[in-house]
C-alpha cells in the first residue's frame, strides 16, 4: 500500500519521491532496505537523500532495489517504500513495456502529452520530443512548458513519445528521458467480450532467482474508446494491493494501445528480486468489461542454469 514503483535508465538522473507525505518541516530518513544502510544527505554522493526525494545522479543498474523512507512527524513515523529498477540502455530504438509510463489519449480538440515525472526535476525549457525515436519536426508540434501539443491530430499521430530534458544539480547536468504511448480517440467504436492476448492460458514463465521479472497482462475489448474496461493481476486470488508483498507491484497506469484498430489494455506485474516462494504462487491475469471477465493463469518456474549459459 505504501510502496511505489520507479524506474530509470543507467547514466541518467532518477529522482524518486517518498510515497508518504508530510509537512515540509518534517525530517525524512532514507535507507537501502536490503542492507538497512542509511542513505547520505550530502550532495557530493552519487546517490543522496534530499527530504522527500531520493536522487540518483546518475543512476546505475546496481542501484536497483527497495528503498525505505521514514517521515518523522511529532506523533508517529510514517514508513514508505520506493521500489527502484535501473535498466541498461537499449541499443535499438524500441522502448520496452517496462520503461513506459501510463498511456494518454488525445483527440482533435485536446492533444497534450505531458512529460512524465518532470515535476521532480530541476529542468529548463525547451524539452526535446521524439516519436518512435525520431525527433519531432514541423509546425504541428509545439513543446510548451512540460508538455507537447500536436495540432490537427490524426490517427497516424498515435505512437510512443519520448521527452528528453536536462536536470541541473549544483551546476552539473544530467540527462533524463521518459516515454509514454499516445492514442487517438476514435469516435466510432464497439465493445466485445475481453480477449487476452498475453499471457497464454496456463503459461509457464521461466525466471531467475534473485533477478527481476515482469509479467504483462494484455487484453483487447473492442474498437474505439472503451468504458469500464480493465486488466489487473491477482496473486492466489488476491488483489496485489491486498497481498502485502512490496516486491510485487503492478504498474499504476494502464497502457491503452490500438492494435489493428482494437482497444487494448496492458498491466505490467513487476517482481523484484524473485524468491523461491514466488514460484509457489498462482498469477492470474484478469480482463473485464461490461460483457464479463476472462482469466488466464501463469505460473513461474526456475530457469535452468544450463539454458541460461547456452
Amino acid at each position: 500500500k505504501f510502496s511505489k514503483q520507479s524506474w530509470g535508465l543507467e547514466n541518467e538522473a532518477l529522482i524518486v519521491r517518498c510515497p508518504r507525505q508530510g509537512k515540509p518541516s518534517y525530517t525524512v530518513d532514507w535507507y537501502y532496505s536490503q542492507t538497512n544502510k542509511s542513505i547520505p544527505t550530502q550532495e557530493r554522493n552519487r546517490v543522496f537523500a534530499s527530504g522527500q526525494l531520493l536522487k540518483f545522479l546518475p543512476a546505475a543498474v546496481a542501484d536497483s532495489g527497495i528503498y525505505t523512507c521514514i517521515v518523522r512527524s511529532p506523533t508517529f513515523n510514517r514508513t514508505g517504500y520506493a521500489n527502484v529498477t535501473i535498466y541498461k540502455k537499449q541499443s535499438d530504438c524500441n522502448v520496452p513495456d517496462y520503461l513506459m509510463y501510463s498511456t494518454v489519449s488525445g483527440s482533435e480538440k485536446n492533444s497534450k502529452i505531458y512529460c512524465p515525472t518532470i515535476d521532480l526535476y530541476n529542468w529548463t525549457a525547451p524539452l526535446e520530443w521524439f516519436k518512435n525515436c525520431q525527433a519531432l519536426q514541423g509546425s504541428r508540434y509545439r513543446a510548451h512548458k512540460s508538455f507537447l501539443v500536436i495540432d490537427n491530430v490524426m490517427t497516424e499521430d498515435a505512437g510512443d513519445y519520448t521527452c528528453k530534458f536536462i536536470h541541473n544539480e549544483n551546476g552539473a547536468n544530467y540527462s533524463v528521458t521518459a516515454t509514454r504511448s499516445f492514442t487517438v480517440k476514435d469516435e466510432q467504436g464497439f465493445s466485445l467480450f475481453p480477449v487476452i492476448g498475453a499471457p497464454a492460458q496456463n503459461e509457464i514463465k521461466e525466471v531467475e532467482i534473485g533477478k527481476n521479472a515482469n509479467l504483462t497482462c494484455s487484453a483487447c475489448f473492442g474498437k474505439g474508446t472503451q468504458f469500464l474496461a480493465a486488466v489487473l493481476w491477482q496473486l492466489n486470488g488476491t488483489k496485489i494491493t491486498d497481498f502485502g508483498e512490496p516486491r510485487i507491484q503492478q504498474e499504476e497506469g494502464q497502457n491503452q494501445s490500438f492494435s489493428n484498430g482494437l482497444a487494448c489494455l496492458d498491466m505490467v506485474l513487476r517482481i523484484a528480486d524473485v524468491k523461491e516462494e514466488d514460484l509457489l504462487l498462482q498469477y492470474d491475469c484478469l480482463a473485464l468489461n461490461l460483457h464479463g471477465l476472462r482469466r488466464h493463469t501463469v505460473r513461474l518456474s526456475r530457469k535452468n542454469p544450463i539454458d541460461h549459459h547456452s
Partner: antibody, heavy 116, light 113 residues
Framework: QVQLVQSGAEVKKPGASVKVSCKAS????????MNWVRQAPGQRLEWMGW????????TYGDNFKGRVTITRDTSASTAYMELSSLRSEDTAVYYC?????????WGQGTLVTVSS | DIQMTQSPSSLSASVGDRVTITCKSS????????????LAWYQQKPGKVPKLLIY???TRESGVPSRFSGSGSGTDFTLTISSLQPEDVATYYC?????????FGGGTKVEIK
C-alpha cells in the same frame, strides 16, 4: 499561482450523502496532501481529515470516521470529500486546504445545507 | 484530542492599539525532533475564507503585514497585532498543527471601538 476551486452549494435531505470536489491548479497535485475542514454557522473550524494525494491514503478525524470518505483523482488534480448519513448539524461550509506547514491555501468553500 | 483554548473570545480596541490574543493547548505542540512548535494562527473576515497569518508559532506567512507576530512555545502561545488597523476586524483562530485530529481554538472576535 496556487488555486483550489470547489464545487457549488448543495441542499440535501437528512440521511442523504453529499460529495464535494476540490480542483487544484498552479502546482503539482501529488506533491502535497489535501485536508478538509468544515465550519458550521457561527462555530469554530473543524478538521475532518486529509488524503495523501500521491498514494491515495486517507486519514479521518474521529468525529467523522464511518461517515466521511476522502478520495482523489490525480489525472484531474482533484480531491473529493463525501459525507453520508447527513443530519441537520452537518449544515456548514466545507473547505479543502492544501497540506503544508499549516494551511496556506484554501478553496473558496462549499455551503452544504441539510434540511427536510 | 488536543484541546485549544483561546482568550478572550472577543475584544474591542482602538485603531493603533496593541492587541494580544492568547491560545493554550492541552498538550505540548513542541516537536523535539526539530524544535518546531506546530501552532498556526488564521484570520477570518465575515463571509470569507480563513487566511494563514503565522505558522510554526512565530513564522509570518509571506505577504502578511509585519504588525502581526506570534510567540510562545509548548502549550502557551500569543498572537500580537502591534498597531490595530481597521482592516484587521476579523475572527482569529489558533490551530494545533502538531497531531491528528488537527484542532482549532474557539476564535477571538476583534472589533474597532
Amino acid at each position: 499561482q496556487v488555486q483550489l476551486v470547489q464545487s457549488g452549494a448543495e441542499v440535501k435531505k437528512p440521511g442523504a450523502s453529499v460529495k464535494v470536489s476540490c480542483k487544484a491548479s498552479g502546482y503539482t497535485f501529488i506533491n502535497y496532501g489535501m485536508n478538509w475542514v468544515r465550519q458550521a454557522p457561527g462555530q469554530r473550524l473543524e478538521w475532518m481529515g486529509w488524503i495523501n494525494t500521491y498514494i491515495g491514503e486517507p486519514t479521518y478525524g474521529d468525529n467523522f470516521k464511518g461517515r466521511v470518505t476522502i478520495t482523489r483523482d490525480t489525472s484531474a488534480s482533484t480531491a473529493y470529500m463525501e459525507l453520508s448519513s447527513l443530519r441537520s448539524e452537518d449544515t456548514a461550509v466545507y473547505y479543502c486546504a492544501r497540506e503544508g506547514d499549516a494551511f496556506a491555501y484554501w478553496g473558496q468553500g462549499t455551503l452544504v445545507t441539510v434540511s427536510s | 484530542d488536543i484541546q485549544m483554548t483561546q482568550s478572550p473570545s472577543s475584544l474591542s480596541a482602538s485603531v493603533g492599539d496593541r492587541v494580544t490574543i492568547t491560545c493554550k493547548s492541552s498538550q505540548s505542540l513542541l516537536y523535539s525532533g526539530n524544535q518546531n512548535n506546530y501552532l498556526a494562527w488564521y484570520q477570518q473576515k465575515p463571509g470569507k475564507v480563513p487566511k494563514l497569518l503565522i505558522y510554526g508559532a512565530s513564522t509570518r506567512e509571506s505577504g502578511v503585514p509585519s504588525r502581526f507576530s506570534g510567540s510562545g512555545s509548548g502549550t502557551d502561545f500569543t498572537l500580537t497585532i502591534s498597531s490595530l488597523q481597521p482592516e484587521d476586524v476579523a475572527t482569529y483562530y489558533c490551530q494545533n498543527d502538531h497531531s491528528y485530529p488537527y484542532t482549532f481554538g474557539g476564535g477571538t472576535k476583534v472589533e474597532i471601538k
